[in-house]
Every structure is written in structure tokens, then in C-alpha cells.
């Protein structure tokens, strides 16, 4: 999906008002310095591409983030403010067998959510020069 035509300011508002709080809740009890940010993004569409990938694609050691509240809110925000996004998701779901996975918080998941927080922070500051 090409995130170029999304309403970035509305997505930012949704992040600031609710998604960010859920990410913080997920990370509670973890030191902010515990994980290094290794995933970056260069502009807002790129940030959303990385956020989608990290949030919804299962990875080795962390298969369950898509079940979390912050993921459900991210998905709904993208569906509302990215034209055509919900159609791509409906079609993808119909084409794919449902994979049910238990929600498990592993250290790998905590690291992944830490990366997500960094991507969202970058998304919120699009005029910042890339480090």
C-alpha cells in the first residue's frame, strides 16, 4: 500500500491522543534506554510503511503485536485517513487463512514496540533532518 495520500495530521492527532498511551502502557516497566533504535524512516509515507510492517507482520520471537490495542487503533486510523487502505485489508484478509496466535509479551516484542515508538516519534517530526 502507498501511504502518500494519507491525512498525516489526522493520523498524528490519533497517535498523540490515544495510540501513544497504549504503546507506553505496553512498555511499562521497561527502561527507555533498554533498547537501541535500529529502524528508521525518512518521510511520513516511509514511516507509515515501517510502522505497518513492524506492527502487523509477525517476526521471529514476536508474533502477536497485531492483537494489541495500539495495533487495532493504528489499523483503524490508517483505514479512516488513508484512502483505499481498508479495501486492501479486506481483500488481504479474504485471501489469507486466519492465523490465530496467542498474545505473548516477549523481550523481542518489547524491543519491537520500542522501535515502533521511535518510528512514531519520527513520523511526528517530518521536518527534522535524518540523523
Amino acid at each position: 500500500y502507498d501511504f502518500t495520500n494519507c491525512d498525516f495530521e489526522k493520523i498524528k492527532a490519533a497517535y498523540l491522543s490515544t495510540i501513544s498511551k497504549d504503546l507506553i502502557t505496553y512498555m511499562s516497566g521497561t527502561k527507555s534506554t533498554e533498547f537501541n533504535n535500529t529502524v528508521s524512516c525518512s518521510n511520513r509515507p516511509h514511516c507509515l510503511t515501517e510502522i505497518q510492517s513492524l506492527t502487523f507482520n509477525p517476526t521471529a520471537g514476536c508474533a502477536s503485536l497485531a492483537k494489541e490495542m495500539f495495533a487495532m487503533k493504528t489499523k483503524a486510523a490508517l483505514a479512516i485517513w488513508c484512502p483505499g487502505y481498508s479495501e486492501t485489508q479486506i481483500n488481504a484478509t479474504q485471501a489469507m487463512k486466519k492465523r490465530r496466535k496467542r498474545k505473548v509479551t516477549t523481550n523481542k516484542c518489547l524491543e519491537q514496540v520500542s522501535q515502533l515508538q521511535g518510528l512514531w516519534r519520527r513520523f511526528n517530526r517530518p521536518l527534522l533532518k535524518q540523523q
Epitope: 490515544t18 494489541e68 490495542m69 487503533k73
Partner: nanobody, 118 residues
Framework: EVQLVESGGGLVQPGGSLRLSCAAS????????MGWFRQAPGKERELVSA???????LYADSVKGRFTISADNSKNTAYLQMNSLKPEDTAVYYC????????????WGQGTLVTVSS
């Protein structure tokens, strides 16, 4: 398996109001999102509003300030109060549910037609 049943659609004049209901039955979970989608003839299905189990809500710009989404967890029912209706709100409205055991809005209602016309 979750079943969703919508009600409340119908014909209404511009400026009028309708309240849609979506009752969920079956195995539901505490962590969820309920969404109201609509599909006008010849257009893509769009998500107009969503409510989450923590009470937070999201609205599309086209309905913000006119539509209000709410949920009664004790009845496993979501509502969409639609005020100041416009002809462009005419569509089939679907409620959909996703919970912490499922994927992208796995559960859908049958749809209810809302027609705004004088």
C-alpha cells in the same frame, strides 16, 4: 464465532436523524474495536467511525460532529447516532468487529440501508 446484527436503517429527510444498532452475540472478548463502515453505490467501502474497548473513538472527517459512536458493553451492542444527515450519507452501513483473537474486522453484519432523500 461472533454474529453481528444491525438495525435502524431507513429513509430519512435531509437534516434528519437515525440511530443504527449493532448487536454482537457469540464468543466476544474484552479487548475489541467496533467499526461502522459504509458503502455507497459505485464507491469503496469506507470506515466512518470506530470505538475501542477502552472507550476511545475515531471519526472520519466527513461525519465528525454529526455522527456519534457509542457502545454498551453489558449488551454487547454498538450504536451510531447520525444527526444532520445529508444526501451524500446515503449508503449501506455495515458494523464490523475485531477483537484480540481475530484479524482485520473478521466479523461483519449484513448491512442496513440508509437513504437520505426528500
Amino acid at each position: 464465532e461472533v454474529q453481528l446484527v444491525e438495525s435502524g436503517g431507513g429513509l430519512v429527510q435531509p437534516g434528519g436523524s437515525l440511530r443504527l444498532s449493532c448487536a454482537a452475540s457469540g464468543r466476544t472478548f474484552r479487548s475489541y474495536v467496533m467499526g461502522w463502515f459504509r458503502q455507497a453505490p459505485g464507491k469503496e467501502r469506507e470506515l466512518v467511525s470506530a470505538i475501542f474497548s477502552d472507550g476511545s473513538t475515531l471519526y472520519a472527517d466527513s461525519v465528525k460532529g454529526r455522527f456519534t459512536i457509542s457502545a454498551d458493553n453489558s449488551k454487547n451492542t454498538a450504536y451510531l447516532q447520525m444527526n444532520s444527515l445529508k444526501p451524500e450519507d446515503t449508503a449501506v452501513y455495515y458494523c464490523a468487529r475485531e477483537d484480540s483473537s481475530s484479524g482485520w474486522f473478521d466479523y461483519w453484519g449484513q448491512g442496513t440501508l440508509v437513504t437520505v432523500s426528500s
